[in-house]
């Protein structure tokens, strides 16, 4: 939701955890605010406190559960609400209802591993983290690899349009040092986004042989 | 469908208060927040004050501690409170009903149902 100077924005992880920025222009640094999460049809309600993440942003995670606990589904609505502090009361600053499943964003994928790596190709793995079951097989992933001398804004991405946790990178370089990220999106969701880009992964290609081209 | 009509606009005095109703009919179950606009000539609406269900409100600066949003459940009724009113207050006033709420600072985004408006004058 926006007003102006004023966003409030929200995702769900799709497990136990709704992460919320709120920013405005123009507010103290100092000013205390907190996002207060009800569910419609559940027993629980969760806060927590925004802290500064940027000169005109606050930041915080409605940690609703364990990690990998199912706390929301498909047909649950939350009503999130932003108050902040300003001298003895607190004011109301937005109010959204949120549809969790509408607003997805995945963490990160993690445990990325070289499963094989030779001259010209590197196979390589990883895991989803806290990704609910409703999914299935219903996600897609993006890769990109860092090529020496080059920014990752200039690396191409590859799409994997399905669940695939590997990957083939083929036509490298031999000898040569490479970094390779991931990130992943539940098809599911009107405002659903790319999780974060994970952890990079340091991997080098093995040296051609002598007298040979591999 | 929800229909909206508003009343209680009129002509006041700088420094007075008026009183906004607004009548809402139709499937009311449906809705989850409700709120005020308001329009002068060759201008954007302005999003003012709007309530949930559960009754929190926000407002925008404009009206902060001026304004008050009240709904009636019973009644089926929406209010807007308007005290230490300003020529600036001068405008065309809307009722308006969201199926979900998205609101920052008395600002609907997404209005699902507006009413026709009533005019509200402020003279000094």
């Known amino acids: 939701a926006v007003n102006g100077t004023s966003q409030f924005t929200c995702f769900y992880n799709s497990r136990a955890n709704i992460s919320c920025v709120w920013s405005q222009d123009g507010a103290l640094q100092d000013t205390s605010c907190q996002v207060h999460a009800w569910p419609d049809r559940r027993r629980w309600n969760q806060t927590c406190e925004l802290l500064p993440v940027s000169q005109a942003s606050w930041a915080c995670n409605l940690i609703l559960g364990a990690p990998d606990s199912q706390k929301l589904t498909t047909v649950d609505i939350v009503t999130l609400r932003v108050l902040c502090r300003e001298g003895v009361r607190w004011r109301v600053m937005a109010i959204q209802d949120f549809k969790p499943f509408e607003n997805l964003r995945l963490m990160a994928p993690i445990s990325l591993q070289v499963v094989h790596v030779e001259t010209h190709r590197c196979n390589i793995s990883w895991e989803i983290s806290q990704a609910s079951h409703y999914f299935e097989r219903h996600l897609e992933f993006e890769a990109r690899t860092l090529s020496p001398g080059h920014t990752w804004e200039e690396a191409p991405l590859l799409t994997l349009k399905q669940k695939q946790e590997w990957i083939c990178l083929e036509t490298l370089t031999p000898d040569t040092q490479y970094e390779f990220q991931v990130r992943v999106k539940p098809l599911q969701g009107e405002f659903t986004t790319w999780s974060p880009w994970s952890q990079p992964l340091a991997f080098r290609t093995k040296p051609a042989a002598l007298g040979k081209d591999t | 469908q929800v229909q909206l009509q508003e009343s209680g606009g009129g002509s006041v005095q700088v420094g007075g208060s008026l009183r906004l109703s607004c009548a809402t009919s139709?499937?009311?179950?449906?809705?989850?927040?409700m709120g005020w606009f308001r329009q002068t000539p060759g201008k954007e609406r302005e999003g003012i004050a709007a309530?949930?269900?559960?009754?929190?409100?926000t407002y925008a600066d404009s009206v902060y501690d001026r304004f008050t949003i009240a709904q009636d459940n019973a009644q089926n009724t929406l209010y807007l409170e308007m005290n230490a009113l300003k020529p600036e207050d001068t405008a065309m006033y809307y009722c308006?009903?969201?199926?979900?709420?998205?609101?920052?600072?008395?600002?609907?985004?997404?209005?699902?149902?507006w009413g026709k408006g009533t005019q509200v004058t402020v003279s000094s």
């Open positions: 139709g499937d009311t179950k449906s809705i989850r927040c």
């Open positions: 308006a009903a969201q199926n979900m709420c998205r609101v920052v600072r008395g600002a609907m985004t997404g209005v699902d149902y």
């Open positions: 309530i949930d269900r559960e009754g929190f409100a």
